[in-house]
């Protein structure tokens, strides 16, 4: 019925308005309603103006799309011609009374279907239902995935790509670790991944200035070292250096009135020359203090070296050796005086004898025919040496003696000339001053070492070599090397060191082979005024130790490998060092600071006498140790 009505309307329009001209009223009769009439008539007039006979040619060339009046007029009532809808977005166009209706395709909206619906922003379907990326497109949308993910068949959800399984060689020699959307190439600690070579490379931490002083890089790590010889140790952060601090203060007070006889490891402390009237005779008076058992107190000789007198200590007793044109004698006598107390000693040449007194009591009287030293030109010229003698004398002694003597003298009076002139010389030389108070023992001041040659292979046991060490120690600082065996190639196959413990006011003892700690005795209170006793025994198969707290045989997985390193070194030559290390690289041992404190060492049953060392730093005191500093009420 509707289409019949439309056909009728079309016929009437043809008859009324195309074949003839119609006015608005006549047009109203065709459409039978105002809205369509009002819509039609102005457009009808435009058609008439365009196509009436006699109109200018320019008008016909206008934008009018119709070839003639009929088609122009017939098109006016059809609201869908020309198409008002957005061509991309519409599905159909429905003509209405002076209006049109565009039906949109899915994904489009608006009166003319001109607006794309953004499905990605639809609140009822968040992100368009996509699990990762929603891409809006004109009239539609699609889901996509981030790098490292693939789309599932539902075209909405994404799944992580396991690059490690997909490409086993993706990380080369490193370990591939899959992570959401990506992968990582992992290296062991101390290594970093090189993208270029697809391999793990050692990180040179040393080039990154990780350490305060010395840094040694090694594959997979690094170690910081501090110059122990300059008094530094590694701090707890294992990077910075701190000063090795004193844990037990010592009384290092000295007096210039006290002459220290062991200032030089080899050599004379003081040399005096006397030119006196010929009636003079040799005499020496002094107070003497030592714990040493052997050494030269003084040596006197004539100007031409033909006659000499030696006053020494052997086995703790006074020994006199003398030689001149008349006689050659050696005498030892009196009580043991290496007791650490001040003993008054006097040696006086009498007319027929030499008298030796201790505490004013005669202990020896040595007969002599004639004067000890022969005067010449009316003068008695005598040279006196303290704590030593000229090197050439050594071969002339009646009985050889180790000249080194750790002791002090005071209140001296030589050749009855008093102490004039001597005190002034000593006063200016700090290292000639003696400590006011000392105790028995050997003192390592933290500035040098002593070297011994000990043959550890001199045993008939199956082990081939052994090192049995007993240490009596009273450290003054909590860090330092007490004993070290050093190979010719500057390695340290065995060392016993002290380090400050992480727990406050205690120390650890480290046993090391080269730069590896093979055993650590933790948290011992060694910085006390009491000596601590440590023992350890090591051979190629075992390591035993005893401390004040325990006795144990050490065994762990790595020990045999480390003992094999030590065994190899012991079969060659090793030098024994006390109190520190010689010039070896910082990295040769875990600790390189000098030991500071008192220490007595017994190796393979022999008590080591520092006077017998191959070499010894002058500041090391072989037979005296400073007392612990006692805090007085005033200080």
């Amino acid at each position: 019925a509707n289409s019949l009505l439309e056909e009728t309307k079309q016929g009437n329009l043809e008859r009324e308005c195309i074949e003839e001209l119609c006015n608005k009223e006549e047009a109203r009769e065709v459409f039978e309603n105002d809205p369509e009439t009002d819509y039609f008539y102005p457009k009808y007039l435009v058609c008439l103006r365009s196509f009436q006979t006699g109109l200018f040619t320019a008008a016909r060339q206008s934008t009018n799309a119709y070839p003639d009046l009929r088609s122009c007029v017939n098109a006016i009532p059809d609201q869908c011609s020309p198409l008002p809808c957005n061509e991309d977005g519409y599905m159909s166009c429905k003509d209405g009374k002076a209006s049109f209706t565009c039906t949109c395709k899915p994904g489009w909206q608006g009166e003319k279907c001109e607006f794309d619906i953004n499905e990605c922003k639809d609140p009822s379907n968040i992100n368009g239902g996509c699990s990762q990326i929603c891409d809006n497109t004109p009239g539609s949308y699609h889901c996509s995935c981030k790098n490292g993910f693939v789309m599932l068949s539902n075209k909405k959800d994404c799944k992580d790509v396991d690059e490690c399984s997909l490409k086993p060689s993706i990380c080369g020699t490193a370990v591939c670790k899959n992570i959401p959307g990506d992968f990582e190439c992992e290296c062991p600690e101390g290594y970093r991944y090189n993208l270029k070579s697809k391999s793990c490379e050692d990180i040179d931490e040393c080039s990154e200035n990780m350490c305060a002083q010395l840094c040694v890089n090694y594959p997979g790590g690094y170690t910081c070292y501090c110059d122990g010889k300059k008094g530094f140790k590694l701090a707890q952060d294992q990077k910075s250096c701190e000063v090795v601090s004193v844990c037990l203060p010592l009384n290092l007070d000295t007096k210039y009135e006290l002459l220290y006889l062991a200032e030089q490891f080899a050599g004379v402390v003081l040399y005096l020359k006397f030119r006196l009237p010929e009636i003079s005779r040799f005499s020496a008076e002094f107070d003497f203090r030592t714990y040493d058992s052997e050494g030269v107190i003084l040596y006197a000789e004539s100007i031409d070296h033909s006659a000499w007198l030696l006053i020494a200590l052997r086995g703790g007793k006074i020994e006199v050796q003398l030689k001149n044109e008349h006689t050659s004698k050696i005498t030892t006598g009196g009580d043991v005086i290496n007791n650490g107390l001040w003993n008054m000693v006097s040696v006086e040449e009498l007319e027929h004898s030499i008298s030796i007194k201790i505490a004013k009591e005669a202990v020896m009287d040595i007969n002599k025919p004639g004067p000890l030293f022969k005067p010449e030109n009316g003068l008695l010229e005598t040279k006196v040496y303290f704590a030593g003698f000229p090197r050439k004398v050594e071969s002339e002694l009646i009985k050889p003696i180790n000249p080194r003597l750790d002791g002090c003298i005071r209140s001296w009076n030589l050749m009855k000339q008093g102490a004039s002139g001597i005190k002034e010389i000593i006063q200016e030389k700090q290292n000639k001053h003696c400590l006011v108070t000392v105790e028995k023992g050997s003192y390592y001041p933290g500035s040098g070492i002593a070297q011994f040659h000990i043959d550890y292979n001199n045993v008939s046991s199956a082990e081939g070599w052994h090192v049995n060490v007993t240490l009596n120690i009273r450290p003054s600082t909590g860090t330092g090397v007490m004993l070290a065996l050093v190979s010719g190639n500057n390695t340290v196959p065995f060392a016993v060191s002290l380090v400050d413990s992480t727990s406050e006011k205690s120390q650890d003892i480290l046993l090391s082979v080269e730069n590896t700690v093979i055993y650590r005795i933790q948290a011992l209170s060694l910085c006390s005024d009491q000596q601590s006793h440590l023992e350890f025994r090591v051979n190629r198969n075992n390591l035993e130790l005893s401390t004040p707290l325990k006795i144990e045989t050490i065994s762990h997985e790595d020990l045999q490998r480390q003992l094999a390193v030590l065994d190899k070194a012991m079969k060659a030559k090793v030098a024994t060092y006390l109190g520190g290390l010689p010039d070896v690289p910082f990295s040769a041992t875990p600790v390189n600071a000098f030991y500071n404190g008192c220490m007595e060492v017994n190796i393979n049953g022999v008590q080591l006498d520092l006077d017998e060392a191959i070499s010894k730093h002058n500041d090391i005191r072989a037979h005296s140790c400073p007392s612990v500093w006692k805090k007085t009420k005033n200080s």
Epitope: S169, I170, Y193, N194, L195, K198, S207
Partner: antibody
């Protein structure tokens, strides 16, 4: 002596596919540790890395261009290739191939591409 | 991606003068490369793996740095050193270059 030489079409129209060849000598791309990259440089501008191929045929691409790039190689003829689809005027640049390897890094002289309609 | 920022963008130096240019990374990198490019030429590698001098490069060039901060130093500028210098990171994909530092002769 290591040498690398790039070759390409010189001029392309927008939407066409660019095919570049890097011919090299003095090393083998099948040797462990070797890799070849493609880098480009628009005139008067900076360098932009495009893709890398490793000795084991592992390939890496610049994500911003990944959908358009394909890197490949022919170890027997000592050549590495790069394809870029749907070129645009923004792809006008000098294209370099570079060897990154164990024995040092070397670049070719470059080949110039102009994209113009 | 790691963004590399080079500074200064342009600088000038007299012959014999010490020159230092920097490359700052948006996140930590392990391996930094430095290139020299002269007009009409391809880039030439100067420094690889942060501080290693490439073959044939004069010893007046040196590289240093770690983490996010790197630098290239020319101990004594020479006329032939006038060029543009680029840093490149080899720590993660995509590989990236700095925008360059143009070094001119004063």
């Amino acid at each position: 002596q290591v040498t690398l030489k790039e070759s390409g079409p010189g001029i392309l129209q927008p939407s066409q596919t660019l095919s570049l060849t890097c011919s090299f000598s003095g090393f083998s791309l099948s040797t462990s540790g070797m890799g070849v990259s493609w880098i480009r440089q628009p005139s008067g501008k900076g360098l932009e890395w495009l893709a890398h191929i490793y000795w084991d045929d592992d390939k890496r691409y610049n994500p911003s261009l990944k959908s358009r790039l394909t890197i490949s190689r022919d170890t027997s003829s000592n050549q590495v290739f790069l394809k870029i689809t749907s070129v645009d005027t923004a792809d006008t640049a000098t294209y370099y191939c570079a060897l990154y390897g164990n024995y040092g890094d070397y670049w070719g002289q470059g080949t110039t591409l102009t994209v113009s309609s | 991606q790691i963004v590399l920022t080079q500074s200064p963008a342009i600088m000038s130096a007299s012959p014999g003068e010490k020159v230092t240019m920097t490359c700052s990374a948006s996140s930590s990198v392990s391996y930094m490369y430095w290139y020299q490019q002269k007009p009409g030429s391809s880039p030439r590698i100067l420094i690889y793996d942060t501080s290693n001098l490439a073959s044939g490069v004069p010893v007046r060039f040196s590289g240093s740095g770690s983490g996010t901060s790197y630098s290239l130093t020319i101990s004594r500028m020479e006329a032939e050193d006038a060029a543009t210098y680029y840093c490149q990171q080899w720590s993660s994909y995509p590989l990236t270059f700095g925008a360059g530092t143009k070094l001119e002769l004063k």
